[in-house]
């Protein structure tokens, strides 16, 4: 297991919510991504492929999420001070082998200006 701080902007604030960006290498074909708050699993997304190369995407702990070819974004809404915590992206790589787990994270600071929905011009 590889642990570390995210070397990219992990938190993107908008309209009283936050997009938490969990990146993975482009070469990764099949994986599970979990979003942890402290040690608790908040959200997860699993991408696998069958023998006909058909993609299956599953969530056991569902959050609004968005998948791209090198990241999973999890969205948290209605931010309040209780959201301030360490968040971790727990990536389990199934394919290509070997199986590997990486953990990257950062601290989500909540400021007053991020709590209310702001108009964007």
């Amino acid at each position: 297991e590889i642990n570390g701080s995210a070397n990219y902007e992990m938190f993107i604030f908008h309209n009283g919510g936050v997009q938490i960006l969990c990146k993975y290498p482009d070469i990764v074909q099949q994986f599970k991504m979990q979003l942890l708050k402290g040690g608790q699993i908040l959200c997860d997304l699993t991408k696998t492929k069958g023998s006909g190369n058909t993609v299956s995407i599953k969530s056991l702990k569902f959050c609004h999420s968005q998948l791209s070819n090198n990241s999973v974004s999890f969205f948290l809404y209605n931010l309040d001070h209780s959201h301030a915590n360490y968040y971790f992206c727990n990536l389990s790589i199934f394919d290509p082998p070997p199986f590997k787990v990486t953990l990257t994270g950062g601290y989500l600071h909540i400021y007053e200006s991020q709590l209310c929905c702001q108009l964007k011009f």
Epitope: I27, K49, S51, N53, S56, K58, P96, P97
Partner: antibody
Framework: EVQLVESGGGLVKPGGSLKLSCAAS????????MDWVRQAPGKGLEWVGN????????EYSPFVKGRFTISRDNVKNTLYLQMNSVKSEDTATYYC??????????WGQGTLVTVSS | DIVMTQSPSSLAVSAGDRVTINCKSS??????????LTWYQQKTGQAPKLLIF???TRHTGVPDRFMGSGSGTDFTLTINSFQTEDLGDYYC?????????FGPGTKLELR
Amino acid sequence: EVQLVESGGGLVKPGGSLKLSCAASGFTFSDYWMDWVRQAPGKGLEWVGNIDEDGSITEYSPFVKGRFTISRDNVKNTLYLQMNSVKSEDTATYYCTRWGRFGFDSWGQGTLVTVSS
Amino acid sequence: DIVMTQSPSSLAVSAGDRVTINCKSSQSLLSGSFNYLTWYQQKTGQAPKLLIFYASTRHTGVPDRFMGSGSGTDFTLTINSFQTEDLGDYYCHHHYNAPPTFGPGTKLELR
């Protein structure tokens, strides 16, 4: 240790039905796509179809589509193949296989289905 | 559907031989940096076993005398220093798209 054990094979008349089962153990069944592959006596391997982890996606060979149905029970750790309107060309050993992300990495011992009047 | 062909269909071999089995697909199996091609071994009366995936990666526990190579549409399985326990049928298989298909097989027999 991964184990797949097929059952339910036997003699069936053309146009008849048969249901095969595959009991899985030694791994988290609900984490894997599963497939059926068949082999006619003295012939090569032929893919029958597959099912994703929770049963929401199924795919079939054009040779069996509309006649065969694959399902699974993740509580019982069992894979099924419902064979309807069988033909003589369906005579084969049917293997239950685990799709291990990039290949069929575990196979059952197979169960023989004979279609004959 | 992608058609897989294999040559030769059968081959007589002796212990210590270097054995080469060829597999050709009707369209490229390369996607990104991966060739979606696997090789299986089937001994008489047994279920098949996975040998090679992604054209060249040996599956866990497979002896290093088995080597896969090739890219695109042309692939090769090589057995360096054939052993008698390697007797059986060998199948290539693609999982580039649905339906995945197998080659017709190559039978290795003792000379």
